[in-house]
Each structure stands twice: as structure tokens, then as C-alpha cells.
């Protein structure tokens, strides 16, 4: 099956790589604009230059193109704890990330929030914190894992999900008491 091509892709595929078909004259192939620039005017004829202009401050194009306008630079979302890793340039969008010892949780494909990496207090680090994944902790005896933090089994009440995790310790305590009374 031939993949469905949009009008722009169909037009571009008629011309060699790095060129696009003139919107008013499909016999002319114009050279695309370099990254960091945008299309101001189509080439007037075959072999003639396309009029490309550099993107203005606050905008960019990251690849060769024939866009009539540059793309607006992204802004890092402070309310999501994001920080700017690198500023926007004419040929590269802003790069946003999290602070040291934080990881990203993606709410959607392009929107992430920064959260602090777990320190594994009362436990050991099983897997270190990564860009998109919190630390994985293994808890010491007498502690259970709750939202990736090690919490004392003394905080575990009956009928909660921690009972299974704390059961071995409870049994050990009972066993010690039982052996002491015989």
C-alpha cells in the first residue's frame, strides 16, 4: 500500500531533495531555506535564488523548510518545576528540563512536570533516578514501600495494602514472643 501523502508532501516529492515546487508554477523547483531562516519570497524562476530571511528573536526553524513564518520559541513551564537547559536560537527551540535530583513525569506527550527523586531513606537504592523515572527503592526490614518511600511498618494498619509487606516482620515478632513463653 502506498502511504497517503498530503498536498504539500505530494508537491515536494516532484522536486529533488532540498527543493520544493513553486506554489504558482509547478514546473519550477525552488531551493528550500536553511534552518534558522524562513521563506520570504519564492524563487522567481529555475536556477534562481529563493528569498530566505533569518528568523527574528523569539522564533526558530530547526530544519530546512519553506515555511512563511518561523516557529515561536517554547517557554519552559515554571509551574511544572521546569528549568531552561538551553535558550532558543534561530535554529533550535528552547530545551527545558528538571533540576538535579529530579525526574520528569509526562502528563501528555509534550508536557512534563518535575518531581524530586526518592532518597530511599530506610532502604537502599535498587535503581538510580533517571531523566524520566524515579529512583526504585528496596526497603529495609520493618519498612514498606509507599509511593516509592520507605515507611515504618508501625504505620501499617490492618486491611491496608502494606499488611502483606509487613507480615513477615509481624510473624517474626510473634515468633519471638511465643518462644519466650515456652
Amino acid at each position: 500500500l502506498v502511504p497517503h501523502l498530503g498536498d504539500r508532501e505530494k508537491r515536494d516529492s516532484v522536486c529533488p531533495q532540498g527543493k520544493y515546487i513553486h506554489p504558482q508554477n509547478n514546473s519550477i523547483c525552488c531551493t528550500k531555506c536553511h534552518k534558522g531562516t524562513y521563506l520570504y519570497n519564492d524563487c522567481p524562476g529555475p536556477g534562481q535564488d529563493t528569498d530566505c530571511r533569518e528568523c527574528e528573536s523569539g522564533s526558530f526553524t530547526a530544519s530546512e523548510n519553506h515555511l512563511r513564518h518561523c516557529l515561536s520559541c517554547s517557554k519552559c513551564r515554571k509551574e511544572m518545576g521546569q528549568v531552561e537547559i538551553s535558550s532558543c536560537t534561530v535554529d533550535r527551540d528552547t530545551v527545558c528540563g528538571c533540576r538535579k535530583n529530579q525526574y520528569r513525569h509526562y502528563w501528555s506527550e509534550n508536557l512534563f512536570q518535575c518531581f524530586n527523586c526518592s532518597l530511599c531513606l530506610n532502604g537502599t537504592v535498587h535503581l538510580s533516578c533517571q531523566e524520566k523515572q524515579n529512583t526504585v527503592c528496596t526497603c529495609h526490614a520493618g519498612f514498606f514501600l509507599r509511593e516509592n518511600e520507605c515507611v515504618s511498618c508501625s504505620n501499617c494498619k490492618k486491611s491496608l495494602e502494606c499488611t502483606k509487606l509487613c507480615l513477615p516482620q509481624i510473624e517474626n515478632v510473634k515468633g519471638t514472643e511465643d518462644s519466650g513463653t515456652t
Partner: nanobody, 120 residues
Amino acid sequence: EVQLLESGGGLVQPGGSLRLSCAASGFTFEWYWMGWVRQAPGKGLEWVTAISGSGGSTFYADSVKGRFTISRDNSKNTLYLQMNSLRAEDAAVYYCAKVKLGGGPNFGYRGQGTLVTVSS
């Protein structure tokens, strides 16, 4: 066994309001981030809003900011979603969900959902 039971959906006119509730059981509700996920007809799941266990931290999708408010009552193991100024594009099945932090977008454990229809 984790159970999440949504209620409060229905038919509302554009500009109207609805309040959704989610009764949670089978886990320690106050320990977890909880939220609302929606799925419009023919579209994928999307996070609408979420709230931390203590209620001190929240997330809202840009499309609902200023119109929707998430809240929780840990003493009642209940999550709420107040939806105001409803629009046609808000029509969807709304699911209560347990948030699994890290990576994503993932949609955690969800309830059966409640249908919200916005139509005049």
C-alpha cells in the same frame, strides 16, 4: 482490591456546570496522587487534572485551566471534579484514576467512567 466508582456525569448545556465524584476503596487513598482522565469519542485518553495525596499540589491540562477544579476529601476517600463553563469539546467519558508517577503519559488504575455530554 482497588475500586474506583465515578458518579455525577450527565447532559449539560454549553456554559453549564457539573460536579463529578469518585469513591475509592481497597487502598490507602491519602497516600496517592489521584486524578481525572477523559476520553472523547474517537480520541485517546488524556489527563485532565490531578492532585497530590495531601491536596497541596495539583496539575491541570491547559484546556481546562480556570474552568475545572480538582479536590479531595481524604476522610471520605473521595475525589471530586468541579467543571464550570463547559464546552462541547469537554464531552467525554471521565475516569477517576490513580496516578503512577514517572515516565508516562500513563493512565494508572482507572474506574469504569462516567459520561459527560455537553449539548444544547
